[in-house]
Interface confidence: medium
């Protein structure tokens, strides 16, 4: 599923991401935009042999199990395919674990490069939340 901007903002808010670990909803929507272009089925392969999955491009070396990433830790204890569902529950639950891990949203390269220090509130402007 490819979410609309406000549709995703509402779903993320419903799942408790607004101000989770101090990160406003706009940060999460911005991250999803530049990680996956709001596409729940996005997959991208990395040079280390791991793959990123879903709307928040969660990595198979650390967070989920895709059965083929050497040394996978699967810290979210889920199959990576669960992160590709049109229901973003699994992605959100795993993202909460990631953002609580010490580096905050710096774990997402796209957030660091495209969202951090910008007017992230623009990503939820005009949305009825």
């Amino acid at each position: 599923k490819v979410f609309g901007r406000c549709e995703l903002a509402a779903a993320m808010k419903r799942h408790g991401l607004d101000n989770y670990r101090g990160y406003s909803l706009g940060n999460w929507v911005c991250a999803a935009k530049f990680e996956s272009n709001f596409n729940t089925q996005a997959t991208n392969r990395n040079t280390d042999g791991s793959t990123d999955y879903g709307i928040l491009q969660i990595n198979s070396r650390w967070w989920c199990n895709d059965g083929r990433t050497p040394g996978s830790r699967n810290l979210c204890n889920i199959p990576c395919s669960a992160l590709l569902s049109s229901d973003i529950t699994a992605s959100v639950n795993c993202a909460k674990k990631i953002v609580s891990d010490g580096n905050g949203m710096n774990a997402w390269v796209a957030w660091r490069n495209r969202c951090k220090g910008t007017d992230v509130q623009a990503w939820i402007r005009g949305c009825r939340l």
């Epitope: 089925q41 042999g49 895709d66 059965g67 083929r68 050497p70 395919s81």
Partner: antibody
Framework: QVQLQESGAEVMKPGASVKISCKAT????????IEWVKQRPGHGLEWIGE????????YYNEKFKGKATFTADTSSNTAYMQLSSLTSEDSAVYYC?????????WGQGTTLTVS | DIELTQSPATLSVTPGDSVSLSCRAS??????LHWYQQKSHESPRLLIK???QLMSGIPSRFSGSGSGTDFTLSINSVETEDFGMYFC?????????FGGGTKLEIK
């Protein structure tokens, strides 16, 4: 137990298309990548590409882009590979395998003859 | 693409001999190297994954070693059932690639 059952041998004319199937049983089909591998005598094994059935995400070896197309039907736990514009170079045995980085589970192979 | 070169192309041995098969990668692939055995008209069978991890049901006479670019499959005291083709495969990067194979035949 995990099994991958491929469709039977095919004899096709040059220029035609063929669709090979791979039915998976014994595991959660949507969770694992299905890989496709080509084997020609004297050419060893070649990785064609892969599909993640749960999402339809696909990756192709550059060499096979435009030649192979992968699809999957999660209702029947079956992956498909269509090969188009067939030539004699496409005559080979085609295998599906479960993509665990390495390939522990293989189909029995589908022999394609183009002539 | 990572190229895998296997040597020798053919190895003629007598049952009871011990042999080593080589697989060399064109660039470092860490330990992401797997070995397969294939007999005529059969699908490949995974023997060893990640350089040295013997798969369940594979006899202990098979072992693997190496890292980076140079890898070896060893068979300690070859048995008649071991004759066939052996392939290496890397999963360090895409596209996945296989070696050209080593044919193990009876002398």
């Amino acid at each position: 137990q995990v099994q991958l059952q491929e469709s039977g041998a095919e004899v096709m004319k040059p220029g035609a298309s063929v669709k090979i199937s791979c039915k998976a049983t014994g595991y959660t089909f949507t969770t694992y990548w299905i890989e496709w591998v080509k084997q020609r005598p004297g050419h060893g094994l070649e990785w064609i590409g892969e599909i993640l059935p749960g999402s339809g995400s696909t990756y192709y070896n550059e060499k096979f882009k435009g030649k192979a197309t992968f699809t999957a039907d999660t209702s029947s736990n079956t992956a498909y590979m269509q090969l188009s514009s067939l030539t004699s170079e496409d005559s080979a045995v085609y295998y599906c395998a479960r993509g665990d980085g390495n390939y522990y589970y293989w189909g029995q192979g589908t022999t394609l003859t183009v002539s | 693409d990572i190229e895998l070169t296997q040597s020798p192309a053919t190895l003629s041995v007598t049952p009871g001999d011990s042999v080593s098969l080589s697989c060399r990668a064109s660039q470092s692939i860490s330990n992401n190297l797997h070995w397969y055995q294939q007999k005529s008209h059969e699908s490949p069978r995974l023997l060893i994954k990640y350089t040295s991890q013997l798969m369940s049901g594979i006899p202990s006479r098979f072992s693997g070693s190496g890292s980076g670019t140079d890898f070896t499959l060893s068979i300690n005291s070859v048995e008649t059932e071991d004759f066939g083709m052996y392939f290496c495969q890397q999963s360090n990067s895409w596209p996945r690639t296989f070696g050209g194979g080593t044919k193990l035949e009876i002398k």
